[in-house]
């Protein structure tokens, strides 16, 4: 199930997925002056089985000598409703694929790719927040957001992060200072079904990752 909205926006912060759940889709977008090749992939799709996940399709861009068109009018069987967008950041540091079953790594850049990426996330996806350069993180709780399904609708949990305008960049994830005692998640879950997946795995994985996964510019 696709998430109906983007992850929450936090002033002076960016978010990043450490890995992408199966079903996630990434638009094949090209920078100005370029277009997808004829009959080229419209998007990449994270697919896999119990032992291995990878991105199906490859995005390819070519010069826009003619207008940006792609001929393909028959929906493919694997096409499914999807959703999400994120500002494009540098591909993350490599993650051991075995550490996060059912997830794909950040796709490598393709030639003449657009300067931002638009992802379409699925329920259970977790993203992590970091203050932009020049801002410092104050925490009330986890600096992360999870797409959950409640009462048949999707929503993102609210990350407990405030970025203050002090000229100091924080480490990520965890270890920001000053940091108040975590209060736990602010959402009070009701008695209806809540669908969450992989939270513990992703949190543990995040805690062991290098902190330099964000960059301010995409090369």
């Amino acid at each position: 199930e696709l998430c109906d909205d983007d992850p929450p926006e936090i002033p002076h912060a960016t978010f990043k997925a450490m890995a992408y759940k199966e079903g996630t889709m990434l638009n094949c977008e090209c920078k100005r002056g370029f277009r997808r090749i004829k009959s080229g992939s419209l998007y990449m799709l994270c697919t896999g089985n119990s032992s291995h996940s990878s991105w199906d399709n490859q995005c390819q861009c070519t010069s826009s000598a003619t207008r940006n068109t792609t001929k393909q009018v028959t929906p493919q069987p694997e096409e499914q409703k999807e959703r999400k967008t994120t500002e494009m950041q540098s591909p993350m540091q490599p993650v051991d694929q075995a550490s996060l079953p059912g997830h794909c790594r950040e796709p490598p850049p393709w030639e003449n790719e657009a300067t931002e990426r638009i992802y379409h996330f699925v329920v259970g996806q977790m993203v992590y927040y970091q203050c932009v350069q020049g801002y410092r993180a104050l925490h009330r709780g986890p600096a992360e957001s999870v797409c959950k399904m409640t009462h048949g609708k999707t929503r993102w949990t609210q990350p407990q992060l405030i970025c203050t305008g002090e000229m100091e960049t924080s480490q990520f994830p965890g270890e920001e200072k000053p940091q108040a005692s975590p209060e736990g998640r602010p959402e009070s879950e009701t008695s209806c079904l809540v669908t969450t997946t992989d939270f513990q795995i992703q949190t543990e994985m995040a805690a062991t990752m290098e902190t330099s996964i964000f960059t301010t510019e995409y090369q």
Partner: nanobody
């Protein structure tokens, strides 16, 4: 509440041009495609063109040489420039919004529809 409102339809002569517009409101459409479909009397609704937030486009074979889709993100509008119109282009033209990347979504699966605008091309 999402609303899609089409405008620009009308009666034109074969060979003429027409520009349809659709104003979208009620949510952020950054990760939605905006698209145009049409439905002629007695026929199924037909995909024409779609465009993403970053201007990636997709056209149906039947119109790709004559129709051009464009998008104005700050105004949440999408346009369909239709040139060299033919009598067989006569139909009700619908604006649509759908989650996900540019792709030819089958009409029953589209998330949001406008009410449609009539285009009639006389010979």
């Amino acid at each position: 509440q999402v609303q899609l409102v089409e405008s620009g339809g009308g009666l034109v002569q074969a060979g003429d041009s027409l520009r349809l517009s659709c104003a979208a409101s009620g949510r952020s459409f950054r990760n939605y495609i905006l698209a145009w479909y049409r439905q002629a009397p007695g026929k199924e609704r037909e995909f024409l063109a779609a465009i993403s937030w970053l201007d990636g486009t997709l056209y149906a074979d039947s119109v790709e040489d004559r129709f051009t889709i464009s998008r104005d993100n700050p105004k949440n509008t999408v346009h369909l420039q239709m040139d060299s119109l033919k009598p067989e282009d006569t139909a009700v033209y619908y604006c649509a919004a759908d989650r996900g990347p540019v792709r030819p979504v089958l009409a029953p699966d589209v998330d949001y529809w406008g009410q449609g605008t009539q285009v009639t091309v006389s010979s």
